[in-house]
Interface confidence: medium
């Protein structure tokens, strides 16, 4: 129903706390360089204005759209052009073009320093002094680094953060209480960020239809007892929620997500038997819980998929008269039978089925032509299954760090033109798939591995889009979203690449590396490894292992030495010489 004042409506629906949090996220995602204080001031002004509209919906400007109100606020920021360059040109446009312009200027890789966590005592002091400001800082810092973070989910992570601090700041050993818990939240939030970015990419590049297909497959796997009408309704609603969040309409997105959670909890009987635990929780926890609820038990008496989609004499009629609906039914039926497949794989199978019908229904004897379609799925299914087996075996053999290094070598050979920091970030993220997925039961591995890899590769594509340097990467990133992972997997050594000349300074290290945290040390070593591969793209695994072992031993020796600086300055050049010889 239409409301006289959109801002009053959203304030009333969401409540002040969530309203303020979402406005802060929205501003931080649009203008990523502004300080917390600048954004906090704008948020307060918007909130005060919303309250005047709640009191009187007919008050001046209360009838304006949220885009108009927020855009006007952002465009009134002093020194916008100095700080943001051409983003300031957006302010010369009218809505809806102005909002589209802001969206196009979101930066997936802003040049901001890493978000450093203060030490426990300092954190607890500032949290106790002003919990609201502390959480505001958290929302601001995460949102500006992740401009497509799913806003209602970020409120959930802030709530988690709040609960952890409340608990741990009361402990004697704050540090050992906080560190593992906050590390856990950070890891989950980072995965949530790349997953959501993938959804927004799907929406931006391929439209709502592509996202809805993803949602149908995912929901059918999770709720195999829900019928197609129910799945379609949920997929339509979920598409709307994601479209709003990806489009910067965060208040509408959070409000509609709450509505969807409410609907699911009121209709558990027709959706799933597994929802009750989630539905007993408060709003943010409820919606988060529903988004990762375990799969319902599959109905025992599902007929073979062939009955409806291969053996039936009306297949071509069904397809011709309502293509999308018929293919949607196929995707639903196949997905509910295969919780053990990745969504990407299910979408590839649906695409193959569609292509087969397109071809066969134009022929003289369609049933004879499409009769073998299910058998033709086999290679499409085997490929990711083999990928999972090979990679999980390798992970189990090498551990996470060794597995990351193997991936780093592989991907540097596939796309040596890509910048080393991007390759290292991608390999570290891709390598985490082992820890995340390979320890799961067999039937959960494939969906976990492939859908996670797809999300990470989406980030690789986004970063590469900014400065395209590799034809291999461009080729894989230009195709459909579901074909990306197989495309990257199939890439081999880039034969067109002219090896980088050997620069001694790239492999020169100083004693400051000894005091770095383990993660930073690993990144330094992995940077050197990528550079080695760029110098010798066809180096064998043995050669690279020799060099890296030598390198690790060198660091270990010099970091234990009494005079570290001397050790680094004398042993360093020897290491460089040995490296060159080993790779010659």
């Amino acid at each position: 129903e239409a409301h006289k004042s959109e801002i009053a409506h959203r304030y009333n629906d969401l409540g002040e706390q969530h309203f303020k949090g979402l406005v802060l996220i929205a501003f931080s995602q649009y203008l990523q360089k502004c300080s917390y204080d600048e954004h906090a001031k704008l948020v307060q002004e918007v909130t005060d204005f919303a309250k005047t509209c709640v009191a009187d919906e007919s008050a001046a400007n209360c009838d304006k759209s949220l885009h108009t109100l927020f855009g006007d606020k952002l465009c009134a920021i002093p020194n916008l052009r100095e700080n943001y360059g051409e983003l300031a040109d957006c302010c010369t446009k009218q809505e809806p073009e102005r909002n589209e312009c802001f969206l196009q200027h979101k930066d997936d890789n802003p040049s901001l320093p890493p978000f450093e966590r203060p030490e426990a005592e300092a954190m607890c002091t500032s949290f106790k002094e002003n919990p609201t400001t502390f959480m505001g800082h958290y929302l601001h810092e995460v949102a500006r680094r992740h401009p497509y973070f799913y806003a209602p989910e970020l409120l959930y992570y802030a709530e988690q953060y709040n609960e952890i601090l409340t608990q741990c700041c009361a402990e004697a050993d704050k540090e050992s209480c906080l560190t593992p818990k906050l590390d856990g939240v950070k890891e989950k939030a980072l995965v949530s960020s790349v997953r959501q970015r993938m959804k927004c990419s799907s929406m931006q590049k391929f439209g709502e239809r592509a996202f809805k297909a993803w949602a149908v497959a995912r929901l059918s796997q999770t709720f195999p007892n829900a019928d197609f009408a129910e799945i379609t309704k949920l997929a339509t609603d979920l598409t709307k929620v994601n479209k709003e969040c990806c489009h910067g309409d965060l208040l509408e997105c959070a409000d509609d997500r709450a509505e969807l959670a409410k609907y699911m909890c009121e209709n558990q009987a027709t959706i799933s038997s597994k929802l009750q635990t989630c539905c007993d929780k408060p709003l943010l926890k409820k919606a988060h819980c529903l988004s990762e609820v375990e799969h319902d038990t599959m109905p025992a008496d599902l007929p073979a998929i062939a009955a409806d989609f291969v053996e039936d004499q009306e297949v071509c009629k069904n397809y011709a008269e309502a293509k999308d609906v018929f293919l949607g039914t196929f995707l639903y039926e196949y997905s509910r039978r295969h919780p053990d497949y990745s969504v990407s794989l299910l979408l590839r199978l649906a695409k193959k089925y569609e292509a087969t019908l397109e071809k066969c229904c134009a022929e003289a004897n369609p049933p004879a032509c499409y009769g073998t379609v299910l058998a033709e799925f086999q290679p499409l299914v085997e490929e990711p299954k083999n990928l999972v087996k090979t990679n999980c075996d390798l992970y189990e053999k090498l551990g996470e760090y060794g597995f990351q290094n193997a991936i780093l070598v592989r991907y540097t050979q596939k796309a040596p033109q890509v910048s080393t920091p991007t390759l290292v970030e991608a390999a570290r993220n891709l390598g985490r798939v082992g820890t995340k997925c390979c320890t799961l039961p067999e039937d959960q591995r494939l969906p976990c591995v492939e859908d996670y890899l797809s999300a990470i590769l989406n980030r690789v594509c986004l970063l590469h889009e900014k400065t395209p340097v590799s034809e291999h990467v461009t080729k894989c990133c230009s195709g459909s979203l579901v074909e990306r992972r197989p495309c990257f997997s199939a890439l081999t050594v880039d034969e067109t690449y002219v090896p980088k000349e050997f620069k001694a300074e790239t492999f020169t290290f100083h004693s400051d590396i000894c005091t770095l945290p383990e993660k930073e040390k690993q990144i330094k070593k992995q940077t050197a490894l990528a550079e080695l591969v760029k110098h010798k793209p066809k180096a064998t695994a043995e050669q690279l292992k020799t060099v890296m072992d030598d390198f690790a031993q060198f660091l270990d020796t010099c970091c234990k030495a009494a005079d570290k600086d001397t050790c680094f300055s004398t042993e360093g050049p020897n290491l460089v010489t040995r490296c060159k010889d080993a790779l010659a």
């Epitope: 019928d227 989609f309 609906v325």
Partner: nanobody, 126 residues
């Protein structure tokens, strides 16, 4: 759950007409693929006509094409079968079956319809 209740059967002379109704409850009929089947004494259930859920695609058995018309009234949540030019071989108990959440009839196989009415008898005889 979908409950179905057929009505409209009876005795009719060859060449005559009848209109069968199937009232549905527990689910909107336009969200459900529904079909009419019939069962003559000593025989299996045979597909007669069907209509898709969400999309009005209709299907007929060859033996009834041009004589029978399937339709539905969403406001009344009811399915109909208009039977004209009836023949003695049309004599049977007529059942309606539903496949909830099916946007299309994609099968003429009775086993794939989980919900059924109790049936209504149609006798064509002079």
């Amino acid at each position: 759950e979908v409950q179905l209740l057929e009505s409209g059967g009876g005795l009719v002379q060859p060449g005559g007409s009848l209109r069968l109704s199937c009232a549905a409850s527990g689910r909107y009929i336009d969200e459900t693929a529904v079909a009419w089947f019939r069962q003559a004494p000593g025989k299996g259930r045979e597909f007669v006509a069907g209509i898709g859920g969400g999309v009005d695609i209709t299907y007929y058995a060859d033996s009834v094409k041009g004589r029978f018309t399937i339709s539905r009234d969403n406001s009344k949540n009811t399915l109909y079968l208009q039977m004209n030019s009836l023949r003695p071989e049309d004599t049977a108990v007529y059942y309606c079956g539903a496949r909830p959440g099916r946007p299309l009839i994609t099968s003429k196989v009775a086993d794939l319809y989980p919900y059924w009415g109790q049936g209504t008898l149609v006798t064509v005889s002079s």
